[in-house]
Every structure is written in structure tokens, then in C-alpha cells.
């Protein structure tokens, strides 16, 4: 069964800066990745970035830099201030559309006890939805 993992890290140098890393553990080819915050995409969450392996990357503030790390994992740096700034308990979700598995989404947030600059290892997060 395919799995999606999500890792959230707060940068030690800038407390309003977060790095989200997501990956897809499956054999299919990824056709689209959507990153959102505040909940799953299409379920109250706000889209931060969309990554298509052939069409490129689109992102919206407070996303600063979205990129493909490998052909099955992505990272997103968020930088914010004021209302657009993420906070420690913000939930981030990654949705991977793949063929032939379909869509798989998982969410994660900053581990409650983590110090700035630290994070939990990238373990698979609970699968919220498989379309």
C-alpha cells in the first residue's frame, strides 16, 4: 500500500520559518503534489504550492521556495510575518496524485516537544484520504 510521509521543521535561525518535506512511498508515477496548511486540500485547507513533474512549480505566500528533492519527494520553505505566519501547531498536508494508485494525502505538524532546528524523523503520517 502506498504511503505519504510528512516532516515539519522550524528553522533555528528564524522562528517564523518552517520547512515542510513530503514524500511518496509507492511504485506509481507522481502526476501532481499539492501542499496546503490548516487542513487537507479541499477540506478547509489553504493551498500553498502545487508541483507538477513536467509543468513546473507554483507557490503562494507565505510559501517562499517549493522544490522537488527527488522524483518522489518535495520540500517547501515557508516564511511569514503577522497573519500569514505559520505557528507551532499549524497542520501541513501533502497530497500526492499518482498513477495508478490514485490520490494519497497525509498531514503533519511540528512535534510538540521539538526545539527550533529539530524535527521528528520523516516517518509515514496517517493517511487521511485515498481517492
Amino acid at each position: 500500500t502506498p504511503e505519504v510521509w510528512v516532516q515539519v521543521r522550524m528553522e533555528a535561525t528564524e522562528l517564523s520559518s518552517f520547512t515542510i518535506r513530503c514524500g511518496f512511498l509507492g511504485s506509481g508515477s507522481i502526476s501532481l503534489v499539492t501542499v496546503s496548511w490548516g487542513g487537507p486540500n479541499g477540506a478547509g485547507g489553504t493551498t500553498l504550492a502545487v508541483l507538477h513533474p513536467e509543468r513546473g512549480i507554483r507557490q503562494w505566500a507565505p510559501a517562499r521556495q517549493a522544490r522537488w528533492e527527488t522524483q518522489s519527494s518535495i520540500s517547501l520553505i515557508l516564511e511569514g510575518s503577522g497573519a500569514s505566519s505559520p505557528c507551532a501547531n499549524t497542520t501541513f498536508c501533502c497530497k500526492f496524485a499518482s498513477f495508478p494508485e490514485g490520490s494519497w494525502e497525509a498531514c503533519g505538524s511540528l512535534p510538540p516537544s521539538s526545539d527550533p532546528g529539530l524535527s521528528a524523523p520523516p516517518t509515514p503520517a496517517p493517511i487521511l484520504r485515498a481517492d
Epitope: G42, T46, T47, L48, H52, P53, E54, R55, G56, I57, R58, W60, A61, P62, R67, W68, E69, T70, Q71, I74, S84
Partner: antibody, heavy 114, light 113 residues
């Protein structure tokens, strides 16, 4: 099928503002972002910016930062672009296009003339 | 900003011939993570909005005839139209799909003799 409906033409006076609309149908409006593109004869296409419905932080081409304001109304599945302080060089065809420019509206011809 | 330069600005060919048009970018359009070049081609026929033809340098959009072929990498790209038809009369634009702002080339106008 996916459709992006735009008014055919707008005639406005120099120094005024105009709000162009782009009504989407045939898909979930909040699933794709809307791009705005300017076309002037002989000058090619220029990307103005994009906006994701529900995200209130549009991206702008710096060239249009003080000219265009992008908004959306999810209730009516409509995207808007307001152009201010209009001048003759703003006369052009303005297109909206969804997502990765997969679908385009027919364009609104904006004529700025006294 | 990435500057996209197309050549020639116009060309005229007879039906059945092959057409090759060039697009050069001022910076590489290669994405290191996917090893894909993020370049798209559009066709704009008179009185119509642009239509996506090719993305990712060489992937044809659904419904686009295989007479249209995209190639290239890095900063140099090419659109080839084999067996040109009368309905191919249009302006062809290349576009940087790599990074904001998503700049277009100046276009190549294809006329049919």
C-alpha cells in the same frame, strides 16, 4: 466542459480604473489557480500574475505590481483583475487562464480612450 | 526575469513542408529534482486565445497531432511541425514554465503560402 467566460470588450477613459471578470464553470473553482495574461499586438504575451482561490496572496509580475490587483469570489466562481490609473498602453486583450494555462478565456479587449 | 527569445519572428512555408522554430532562454529551464526542462509551447490562431500544445519541452497536450514535436534542453529549445497544414496558420509562443514571472517569447508567426 471547462469554460472561462470573459466580457468581450470594455471602453474606459484614461486615468480611471476597470475591473475585468473571469467566470469559471465546468470544474471545481477552488482546485485550480487563475492566471492573467496581457496581449498587445506585435508585443506578444505577458504574464501579469496568478491567484489561488481561497489564498489571499496573489503572485504578480513586478512590472504589473502597481497596475493590477487580483481577487477571487469563490461563491460565484469568478476571478477579477482590477487595473488602475489606466493609460493608452493598457489597451490590450486580457486573458484569464486556469491552472498550468490549460484552459483560456476568450479574452476581454480593453480600450483606453478619451 | 528569464528572457525568452524566439526566432525567426515569421516564416512562410507551403503545405506539406517541415517547419522548425527556435526558442532560447536566458537561464536554464532544467529542474534538478525531476530532470525535466520546464518549457511550454502555445499556438494562437487569429481571433482565438492561445492553446497549449506542448509542455515539459516534449510532451504533447491531449489532442495535439503528432506532427508537432518539441525538443531541447537547458536554454535551447525547438518546435518542429512536420507536414504543415493550412490550419497551422498561427503565432507560436514558447514559455518559461520554470519560475516566476512566467515569461513568454515574442512569438513566431507561421504563414502558409
Amino acid at each position: 466542459q471547462v469554460q472561462l467566460q470573459q466580457p468581450g470588450a470594455e471602453l474606459v477613459k484614461p486615468g480611471t480604473s476597470v475591473k475585468l471578470s473571469c467566470k469559471a464553470s465546468g470544474y471545481n473553482f477552488t482546485s485550480y489557480w487563475i492566471n492573467w495574461v496581457k496581449l498587445r499586438p506585435g508585443q506578444g504575451l505577458e504574464w501579469i500574475g496568478d491567484i489561488y482561490p481561497g489564498n489571499y496572496s496573489p503572485n504578480y509580475n513586478e512590472k504589473f505590481l502597481n497596475k493590477a490587483t487580483l481577487t477571487t469570489d469563490t461563491a460565484s466562481s469568478t476571478a477579477y483583475m482590477q487595473l488602475n490609473n489606466l493609460a493608452s498602453e493598457d489597451s490590450a486583450v486580457y486573458y484569464c487562464a486556469s491552472g498550468y494555462f490549460d484552459y483560456w478565456g476568450q479574452g476581454t479587449t480593453l480600450i483606453v480612450s478619451a | 526575469d528569464i528572457v525568452m527569445t524566439q526566432s525567426p519572428s515569421s516564416l512562410s512555408v507551403s503545405a506539406g513542408e517541415e517547419v522548425i522554430m527556435s526558442c532560447k532562454s536566458s537561464q536554464s529551464l532544467l529542474n534538478s529534482g525531476t530532470q525535466k526542462n520546464y518549457l511550454a509551447w502555445y499556438q494562437q490562431k487569429p481571433g482565438q486565445p492561445p492553446k497549449l500544445l506542448i509542455y515539459g519541452t516534449s510532451t504533447r497536450e491531449s489532442g495535439v497531432p503528432d506532427r508537432f514535436t518539441g525538443s531541447g534542453s537547458g536554454t535551447d529549445f525547438t518546435l518542429t511541425i512536420n507536414n504543415v497544414q493550412a490550419e497551422d496558420l498561427a503565432i507560436y509562443y514558447c514559455q518559461n514554465d520554470h519560475s516566476y514571472p512566467y515569461t513568454f517569447g515574442g512569438g513566431t508567426k507561421l504563414e502558409i503560402k
